[in-house]
Interface confidence: low
């Protein structure tokens, strides 16, 4: 999947299986990524688990779990708030669009999470205070948390290079560069560009991600995934100057 | 698919605050965590044959279950985590009802915290 980190680095990660996105004293988020096509290096998120940890008099521990074709509007115990404590309503799930869009607000830690199902796969977005991000007991023994550290260099796909290489060419030209050898050859570059431009008129990294995804999979739902990801940034990002990211400096994994 | 034992391990680790024999934890909660852990290992068993961490976990679970007299059957709901060290002390004195503490506890020291964003989408 495409990852925008807490430090506004933008990466395309081919990480497969279960990976932690966030882990601190209040919150743990894990995603499971699966290949989008047989033989493809590109992966997308098929499962998401969010654990809101027990917090003082405010909330009991609550676990939210979403999977492909299952975007519940409740925690796994069936509740929609933080439990039986006095401050239970400082944690709330709201269903925005049934089966497609859920918002979780954890006011006691100033955090908003948006989970969507777009096509077969899930998207995740969060707004969280730095104070919460940094609330970890032992920095040195922290593992690999994608939102904080980015994904390891050997798990990154350089989709910008891919995008540059395929500009103005048809799908046959990109077959060698594509991380999905079985990607449909019926999706020319021009069509991908047109579809992405429709939803994402600004040629930023979200637009480039959209083009990459269409060329890689031939699945037009990925246009919507990029579109909604940008919409969620608009809603959640505190710095309105950083909504659109344009070029990625060659990054090393953040560790 | 690859062996997911490290995921099971980290879930158990976080769920029990890393304590092998938590004196302060209620045994039922610890047992529930162990049963969740056991369930997780069973789900990934097929892909973990021969993996050190997997077999180490399986044996460890059996050992811990017997130490804590846990029954194999019972609830597997995630146990309560340890009470978290607050980023800002939510016990500050105030005339507001307790719920208000919860809604503002994270930024007691700064009226408008610096927010940050992370997102994951597409492929």
């Amino acid at each position: 999947p495409h990852l925008r980190t807490f430090t506004d680095r933008f990466q395309t990660c081919k990480v497969q299986g279960a990976w932690p996105l966030i882990d601190n004293n209040y919150l743990n988020v894990q995603v499971t990524n699966t290949p989008v096509l047989p033989g493809s290096a590109a992966t997308a998120t098929s499962k998401l688990t969010i654990i809101f940890k027990n917090f003082q008099e405010c909330v009991d521990q609550k676990v939210y779990q979403a999977e492909m074709d299952e975007l519940p509007a409740a925690f796994v115990d069936g509740s929609k708030n933080g439990g039986d404590k006095h401050g239970a309503n400082s944690l709330k799930i709201t269903e925005k669009v049934s089966g497609q869009h859920v918002e979780i607000r954890a006011k006691y830690i100033g955090t908003t999470i948006v989970v969507r199902q777009v096509g077969r796969y899930l998207t995740f977005a969060v707004r969280v205070p730095e104070e919460v991000v940094n609330a970890v007991e032992d920095w040195d023994s922290q593992g690999l948390y994608l939102c904080l550290r980015g994904c390891p260099l050997n798990q990154q796909i350089d989709f910008q290079a891919f995008h540059t290489n395929t500009e103005g060419t048809g799908a046959r030209r990109l077959a060698a560069a594509s991380p999905a050898p079985t990607a449909p050859e019926t999706f020319p570059y021009e069509t991908a560009v047109a579809k992405c431009k429709e939803k994402l008129p600004v040629e930023d990294l979200y637009y480039q991600a959209c083009v990459f995804d269409l060329l890689t999979t031939g699945d037009v739902n990925f246009t919507l995934a990029a579109y909604y990801a940008l919409e969620d940034v608009k809603m959640l990002h505190s710095n309105k100057d950083k909504l659109h990211l344009y070029e990625r400096t060659r990054d090393l994994p953040g560790r | 698919s690859p062996c997911k034992i490290l995921k099971c391990n980290s879930e158990f680790w976080s769920a029990t605050s890393g304590s092998h024999a938590p004196a302060s934890d209620d045994t039922p909660e610890f047992c529930a965590a162990l049963r969740s852990y056991a369930l997780c290992t069973r789900r990934t068993a097929r892909t973990c044959r021969g993996d050190l961490a997997y077999h180490s976990a399986v044996h460890g679970i059996e050992d811990l279950m017997s130490q804590h007299n846990c029954s194999k059957d019972g609830p597997t709901s995630q146990p309560r985590l340890h009470t978290l060290p607050p980023a800002g002390d939510s016990q500050e004195r105030s005339d507001s009802p307790e719920i208000c503490h919860c809604e503002k506890s994270f930024h007691k020291h700064s009226a408008t915290p610096n927010y940050t964003h992370c997102g994951l989408f597409g492929d």
């Epitope: 390891p152 560790r255 | 021969g50 993996d51 961490a53 180490s56």
Partner: antibody, heavy 120, light 109 residues
């Protein structure tokens, strides 16, 4: 007291096999894995492999695949490591070690070591 | 050659602090929470000093501490004592790779 007691020193000729034993006491034998580690004279530690007494599953270091066999006898709480087609470079002290339980992977109890000398 | 690199030797006077580094790859150290350290006196079996990067087994003095940054794990001995003179090995487990460092001789001057 948790203990691992190993068999005595061995002198072998090149091409022969050696079988080292490691008797565990003071804990539930099937609840922990057993690792085998060797150390050539003046050299560092070299991980050889691991066995689960509970299931019999093994995981061997790639360079020893085909030459090493690890087994256990749960009735006597004993682990065995057999190394075949011995070469002079197999001369080393061989240690068994208990693997920490649960979601931890470390060797928390070690045997006293068995010196195996391979010489013609 | 070991895939985990340690300095051959470090030394310090009694009461000083010494740090031993253990550098690997992202998979062997960077992504692994299973880094442990062993102390070995001449002619003796190794002894577990730290596990899971930072944790100390009971009986190990608190002057031994561990940390990790990126692909490097470190063992620090603060308040060096004569009995700390020994070889120290780091060990990492990630996936099915099990590796020891080449060892570091700590000398108390």
């Amino acid at each position: 007291e948790v203990q691992l007691v190993q068999s005595g020193a061995e002198v072998k000729k090149p091409g022969a096999s050696v079988k080292v034993s490691c008797k565990a006491s003071g804990y539930t034998f099937t609840s922990h894995g057993i690792s085998w580690v060797r150390q050539a004279p003046g050299q560092g530690l070299d991980w050889m492999g691991w066995i689960s007494p509970y299931s019999g599953n093994t995981n061997y270091a790639q360079k020893l695949q085909g030459r090493v066999t690890m087994t256990t006898d749960t009735s006597t709480s004993t682990a065995y490591m057999e190394l075949s087609s011995l070469r002079s470079e197999d001369t080393a002290v061989y240690y068994c070690a208990r693997v920490g339980s649960g979601p931890y992977y470390y060797m928390d109890v070690w045997g006293q070591g068995t010196l195996v000398t391979v010489s013609s | 050659q070991s895939a985990l690199t340690q300095p051959r030797s470090v030394s310090g006077s009694p009461g000083q602090s010494v740090t031993i580094s253990c550098t690997g790859t992202s998979s062997s150290v960077g992504d692994s929470i299973y880094v442990s350290w062993y102390q070995q006196h001449p002619g003796k079996a190794p002894k577990l000093m730290l596990y899971d990067v930072t944790k100390r087994p009971s009986g190990v003095p608190d002057r031994f501490s561990g940390s990790k940054s990126g692909n490097t794990a470190s063992l620090t001995i603060s308040g060096l004592q004569a009995e700390d003179e020994a070889d120290y090995y780091c060990h990492s487990y990630a996936g099915t790779d099990t590796l020891f460092g080449g060892g570091t001789k700590v000398t108390v001057l």
